[in-house]
Amino acid sequence: DAHKSEVAHRFKDLGEENFKALVLIAFAQYLQQCPFEDHVKLVNEVTEFAKTCVADESAENCDKSLHTLFGDKLCTVATLRETYGEMADCCAKQEPERNECFLQHKDDNPNLPRLVRPEVDVMCTAFHDNEETFLKKYLYEIARRHPYFYAPELLFFAKRYKAAFTECCQAADKAACLLPKLDELRDEGKASSAKQRLKCASLQKFGERAFKAWAVARLSQRFPKAEFAEVSKLVTDLTKVHTECCHGDLLECADDRADLAKYICENQDSISSKLKECCEKPLLEKSHCIAEVENDEMPADLPSLAADFVESKDVCKNYAEAKDVFLGMFLYEYARRHPDYSVVLLLRLAKTYETTLEKCCAAADPHECYAKVFDEFKPLVEEPQNLIKQNCELFEQLGEYKFQNALLVRYTKKVPQVSTPTLVEVSRNLGKVGSKCCKHPEAKRMPCAEDYLSVVLNQLCVLHEKTPVSDRVTKCCTESLVNRRPCFSALEVDETYVPKEFNAETFTFHADICTLSEKERQIKKQTALVELVKHKPKATKEQLKAVMDDFAAFVEKCCKADDKETCFAEEGKKLVAASQAALGL
């Protein structure tokens, strides 16, 4: 529907509170370095303007697009050139090029200080003193660090954040109540950000067709009783929502997501039997709940897929008449029968099927040519099954920390050019697949593991894209979205890599390591491990284990010493010498 004033339309649909929150998120995701106060000022100005448009849609500038209004507002920031450099050049462009320009300058790894959590009493005081500012600051800090965070979902996180403080700041033991809740929100938030980043990468790097294929597979697994036409409608609507959010159109995105949740709940009888509880919740909880809802039960007596997609004489006719619709039906039918497969595996099978039809439908005897297409699926299914089995066995044998270390070594040898912080971050996350997925029964392991790995490898891809250093990473990241994980799995040790010069400073540690949390201490040790492999890529597992064991013993010993700093200085030199000898450096 065409509205006289888009800004008035969205303000009325979303309400003032959500409107302001979403504009703040949008601005913080674009101008990630701007101070909080500057953003609040811009948001207030936009809000006041929106209110004038609500009062009179014909008022001056009310007919302008949201991109024009928001872009104009962002371009009023005085320090744009000094703070953002060439991003300021975006302001010389006209819409829609200006918005595209802002999008291209979003930084997945902004140079921002780590968020340090204040004392609980300090946080509770700040919350009570000015609840609105406290919650806005939360939105701002998350949005600027995660420029692709799914905005309507961030509103849900903020609601939970507020609820945590409301409850816990009145509790007898505030810290015991609040800290686990904040930890949970932080971990869920990071996971949510990474999942959304993959959706945006899918849309932006591989196009709408790739995203729609992903959505068909996932929704068909989740709603196996829904008809293909219903799934197709949901896919179209979901694609619109994510295209908008990934494109910075956060008001439209949130509005359309609410409409989609409403539609799903109004039509749950023809979608899924699992939606009842979700649909009784308020809007933000409802949308979140629907997005996370468990797979419905598969319909009984689903016929063989082969009948329509292999045995039928009409395969090539159906394919030629509407290729994407036919492949979509194949994907829908396969996915609804296989909640035990990862989405990426289902997409690989669909791609194999498509390639076979492209070849066979041009052959002299098409049926003879494609008759054995399902046999080609077997190795594609077995590859992730075997990989998950092996890695879960390794995880159960080693535990999470040592499993992460095994992956650190493995990935550093594959792509040693990648920066150490990125290798540590990505390998630690890859390692979390163990505790996240290996506990599941066989039928749930693959969708859990491989789809999670897709999310983590996308982190590597977006970080690497900012500063490309490895052709192998670029190749695996850009050739095929669904084959990224098999591509990385297939990489062997990079024989072309020239080992890094030894630098004793990299292996010099101080007493401050003793006061770090267990997690931070692990990261320090894992950073050292990556550096070791970069210096000695041919080092054996046994050699690396010996050095790491010595290092752990060294840290433990010096942290117990009376004069910690002296211990770290003297014992550290010995450790470096011993390690050099052990590794032949």
Partner: antibody, heavy 121, light 110 residues
Framework: EVQLVESGGGLVQPGGSLRLSCAAS????????MGWVRQAPGKGLEYIGI???????YYASWAKGRFTISRDNSKNTLYLQMNSLRAEDTATYFC???????????????WGQGTLVTVSS | IQMTQSPSSLSASVGDRVTITCRSS????????LSWYQQKPGQPPKLLIY???DLASGVPSRFSGSGSGTDFTLTISSLQPEDFATYYC???????????FGGGTKLTVL
């Protein structure tokens, strides 16, 4: 007992619409391709179309656009929606189960008794 | 696509060997997607033969089918009283939209 029972036939005016039903019992309707065939009084058999196990529909060229085959798996029922009916559509309409699942082989091995549709003003 | 049956009517006696032919205007799918039906007044058709020569379940062995491509034959080796009926051929072609029935052969008592 494995059987097909058609219903919904009757007298309809030219230009009118009618929906025929075919209730299956003793087997799952979605396990085979299901078709509709008609027979005008004193005439031969005429193929209308089929719906495959996966829901693909195929129609004789004369039926395309006016006739629609669908099914409701939960009710184990097959349907034939007929629009813009003409006098020449007067016939007994049979639903039938094809030997194949994904296409029409022309080999229908289970038939209903048929339902008579009369198009007349 | 046309399916032409001949003869359109035929009179014979119990014990006779009877042959009905069916010709299609183009080759049936896989050269063998041809079926034969028997229909008695007031009843639905009954499948006799599928894939040109395979006998449907419960059909007596006196019925047989042969042929390939465009020319097919139904043979009743020794006519029984219950065999007097109308017989139809049906062909499946490269598209499921093109399935077609022959015009029928009415078999009556001589």
């Amino acid at each position: 007992e494995v059987q097909l029972v058609e219903s919904g036939g009757g007298l309809v005016q030219p230009g009118g619409s009618l929906r025929l039903s075919c209730a299956a019992s003793g087997f799952s309707l979605s396990s085979n391709a299901m078709g509709w065939v008609r027979q005008a009084p004193g005439k031969g058999l005429e193929y209308i179309g089929i719906i495959s196990v996966g829901g693909f529909t195929y129609y004789a060229s004369w039926a395309k656009g006016r006739f629609t085959i669908s099914r409701d798996n939960s009710k184990n029922t097959l349907y034939l929606q007929m629009n813009s009916l003409r006098a020449e559509d007067t016939a007994t309409y049979f639903c039938a189960r094809d030997r194949h699942g994904g296409d029409s082989s022309g080999a229908f091995y289970l038939w209903g008794q048929g339902t008579l549709v009369t198009v007349s003003s | 696509i046309q399916m032409t049956q001949s003869p359109s009517s035929l009179s014979a006696s119990v014990g006779d060997r009877v042959t009905i032919t069916c010709r299609s205007s183009e080759s049936v799918y896989s050269n063998n997607q041809l079926s034969w039906y028997q229909q008695k007044p007031g009843q639905p058709p009954k499948l006799l033969i599928y894939d040109a020569s395979d006998l449907a379940s419960g059909v007596p062995s006196r019925f047989s089918g042969s042929g390939s491509g465009t020319d097919f034959t139904l043979t009743i080796s020794s006519l029984q009283p219950e065999d007097f009926a109308t017989y139809y051929c049906a062909g499946g072609f490269s598209s499921s939209s093109d399935t077609a029935f022959g015009g029928g052969t009415k078999l009556t008592v001589l």
